[in-house]
């Protein structure tokens, strides 16, 4: 009880005049505060609390929620207390089942006794289970029994206050803790898609996937360098009791040019915050960008394979390609695919398999392609190699010796003149005509050369050479000559 | 003791606007997820729109989404709802909600409700 | 959206008999995140049950709650004058939030 200083207030005096007060329930509490400048009584237990403006309070009858703490107040402010248990075989606990704990925090049970003298007053679990080993806690008959540091793991747990009375233990209603967990990460964030094309008008929709321990981490859609709030709708699940799930959804109704760039989806929790981005890229019309993966003028050997390979940017996606050669559309021998299976993939591959190519099927090979706004092409010239083929080879009534070669490219005819029987020619002879015979005709194919030489000049018997030759290899063609006396009596031309 | 005390309810024409108050007292606000609930007369409850304690999660039901918005204010204890292009089919009792300590959605404390009336 | 149906709309019996009604969802309700409201006339409802079993503080335990996935039971082993309610599921598992259309349980 409180001494008295003589000049400052003191607090009241409480009779009778202890700290603790046994009563056994049926009995009466009395209580008397002692002070001139008297206010009120207060009593308080679990929540609850009651007030008396009597300087005595009276129970008559004593139940055992009566138990807790009465505190006499006066004028000053200045107050003394004291704490009555209520003795009640039948009822050795009062329990407010509540029970609700923050984690890495202690928290109370709050089962305070009726009788301060039973033994072992601790907590057990529910049905005979045992309690979590690490499960640490401090028993306060007055309070109840504190849990400390709550763990994850004890959410949803199912215990009882316990005691021994009398050589018996009793056990308290059950309580289940509930635990909000602490945050001990940043939020996971991830957009259903890295970035968006879309052409004026269409609607732009983006989902921001946010997971967290609880409901509360904070989200939010925000653009890149702007403070405009933007209009986003959220979904959220509880997959489990620490594993909740929100999505957040951006969505702009008629997208416009204007609205192109970034989009960021934050998201934080008292531990610290993430991010990520999506980028909007938004067209007044779709478009059609083709790129050769070869040269567009392709030279190939006769009887080998080319491939004619495009990639092409399409958007909105390519509806008609095709391969094209002399107004003919191919079939087959072609294959078109996307370059990734990416849900945003623009960008296409389309491949021709010329196979086994004839020096007649050079030409000018289109690959046209369109979608819903666009269309485009690309040509690809293709010139086959072809060894040169001697066409004719003749003596003319002038007496010249004529020569005409075809191949691609254009053949060099050159003439040797071999003294006697011999096929190995060396000495060379100038050609008196050579022209190419279809330099104005189509663009591709082979080209046609006549090459002539006088064959007056040649005043011994022997053979004369024509070869013809080119990048891709050599034909030769040979006439015989044969002198009787001053004539020339026999020419025979042969390969 | 917790308590939630709505307001602001009251008869309204079509397409006309009002403000729902919820005060709440009697725990600490700010670490609550809150939710409105209506219930059209003689009618079954209907979830309207959920706010997070830190106000970083909104949700509204199909049938509000675009006029009614819900926020909260953790310093004077109040949650509201903003009713704009009121409809007949919005006349109802609406009922703020507290959702329990570690758990949104589940709501273990209701106030008694203020009756909105959307009428010409 | 989850859709809650509860059936039967009405129940009618005598005090003292066991009282079951039904809730079933249109899909699965994970971690049983699914709850039972009591609604008396002229008052706001009031949490019997959650987490599909657990009786929430100060609730009698005549009370009772059972199911998992779809299906779910709210049991009321005796029935009292004072239990005259209609009585709510609701699911917390995902928005939105959806209520069943209610059991409204009278005394025969």
């Known amino acids: 009880q409180p001494s008295v200083s003589p000049g400052e207030p003191s607090p009241p005096s409480i009779h009778p005049a202890k700290s603790e007060l046994i009563v056994r329930v049926g009995n009466e509490i009395r209580l008397l505060c002692i002070d001139p400048g008297f206010v009120k009584w207060t009593f308080e237990i679990l929540d609850e609390t009651n007030e008396n403006k009597q300087n005595e309070w009276i129970t008559e009858k004593a139940e055992a929620t009566n138990t807790g703490k009465y505190t006499c107040t006066n004028k000053h402010g200045l107050s003394s207390s004291i704490y009555v248990f209520v003795r009640d075989p039948a009822k050795l606990f009062l329990v407010d089942r509540s029970l609700y704990g923050k984690e890495d925090n202690d928290t109370l049970v709050r089962c305070p006794l009726t009788d301060p003298e039973v033994t072992s007053y601790s907590l057990k679990g529910c049905q005979g289970k045992p309690l979590p080993k690490d499960l640490r806690f401090v028993p306060d008959p007055k309070a109840g029994i504190t849990i400390k540091s709550v763990k994850r793991a004890y959410h949803r747990l199912c215990l009882h206050c316990s005691a021994d009375q009398e050589g018996k233990s009793v056990l308290s209603d059950k309580f289940i803790l509930k635990v909000r967990p602490a945050f001990k990460a940043v939020p996971v964030v991830s957009v259903s898609k890295a970035s968006y094309l879309l052409r004026e008008g269409e609607e732009f929709t983006v989902t921001c996937t946010i997971k967290d321990v609880s409901s509360s981490v904070y989200s939010t859609w925000k653009r890149e360098n702007s403070q405009t709030k933007l209009q986003e709708k959220y979904n959220s699940w509880h997959h489990g009791d620490f594993n909740y799930e929100r999505q957040a959804t951006l969505t702009i109704s008629s997208a416009r040019v204007n609205d192109s760039g970034v989009f960021m989806c934050y998201a934080n929790n008292t531990f610290g915050s993430a991010n990520v981005t999506t980028t909007l890229e938004v067209v007044d019309k779709g478009f059609i960008n083709i790129f050769p993966m070869i040269n567009t003028t392709v030279f190939v050997n006769d009887g080998e394979n080319v491939d004619l390979i495009v990639e092409y940017e399409a958007f909105p996606k390519p509806e008609h390609q095709q391969w094209i050669y002399m107004n003919r559309t191919f079939t087959d021998k072609w294959e078109d695919y996307p370059k990734s299976e990416n849900e945003s993939n623009i960008r296409y591959v389309s491949e021709l398999h010329l196979t086994r190519l004839k020096g007649t099927e050079g030409g000018t090979y289109t690959f046209l392609v369109s979608n819903s706004d666009v269309n485009a092409s690309i040509a690809f010239n293709v010139y086959v190699n072809t060894k040169p083929e001697i066409l004719t080879y003749d003596r003319l009534v002038n007496g010249m010796l004529q020569c005409v070669a075809a191949g691609f490219p254009e053949p060099t005819i050159d003439w040797y003149f071999c003294p006697g029987t011999e096929q190995r020619c060396s000495a060379s002879v100038l050609p008196v005509d050579v022209q190419t015979l279809n330099a104005s005709g189509p663009p591709f194919g082979k080209l046609v050369v006549q090459s002539s030489i006088d064959s007056s000049a040649f005043k011994h018997n022997g053979t004369v050479e024509c070869k013809a030759y080119n990048d891709v290899g050599k034909t030769s063609a040979y006439f015989n000559f044969a002198f009787k006396g001053n004539n020339k009596e026999q020419i025979h031309p042969h390969t | 003791e917790v308590q939630l005390l709505e307001s602001g309810g009251g008869l309204v024409q079509p397409g006309g606007s009002l403000r729902l108050s919820c005060a709440a007292s009697?725990?600490?606000?700010?670490?609550?997820?809150m939710s409105w609930v209506r219930q059209a007369p003689g009618k079954g409850l209907e979830w309207v729109s959920a706010?997070?304690?830190?106000?970083?999660?909104?949700y509204y039901a199909d049938s509000v989404k675009g006029r009614f918005t819900i926020s909260r204010d953790n310093s004077k204890n109040t949650l509201y709802l903003q009713m704009n292009s009121l409809r007949a089919e919005d006349t109802a009792v609406y009922y703020c909600a507290k959702d329990t300590w570690w758990l949104a959605g589940l709501f273990d404390y209701w106030g008694q409700g203020t009756l909105v009336t959307v009428s010409s | 959206e989850i859709v809650l149906t509860q059936s039967p709309g009405t129940l009618s019996l005598s005090p003292g008999k066991r009282a079951t009604l039904s809730c079933r969802a249109s899909?699965?309700?994970?971690?049983?995140?699914l709850a039972w409201y009591q609604q008396k006339p002229g008052q706001p409802p009031k949490l019997l049950i959650y987490w599909a079993s657990t009786r929430e503080s100060g609730v009698p335990d005549r009370f009772s709650g059972s199911g998992s996935g779809t299906d779910f039971t709210l049991t009321i082993s005796s029935l009292q004058a004072e239990d005259v309610a209609v009585y709510y599921c609701q699911q917390y598992y995902s928005t939105p939030l959806t209520f069943g259309g209610g059991t409204k349980v009278e005394i025969k």
């Open positions: 899909q699965s309700v994970s971690n049983s995140y």
């Open positions: 706010i997070g304690y830190g106000g970083g999660g909104k």
């Open positions: 009697g725990f600490t606000f700010s670490d609550y997820g």
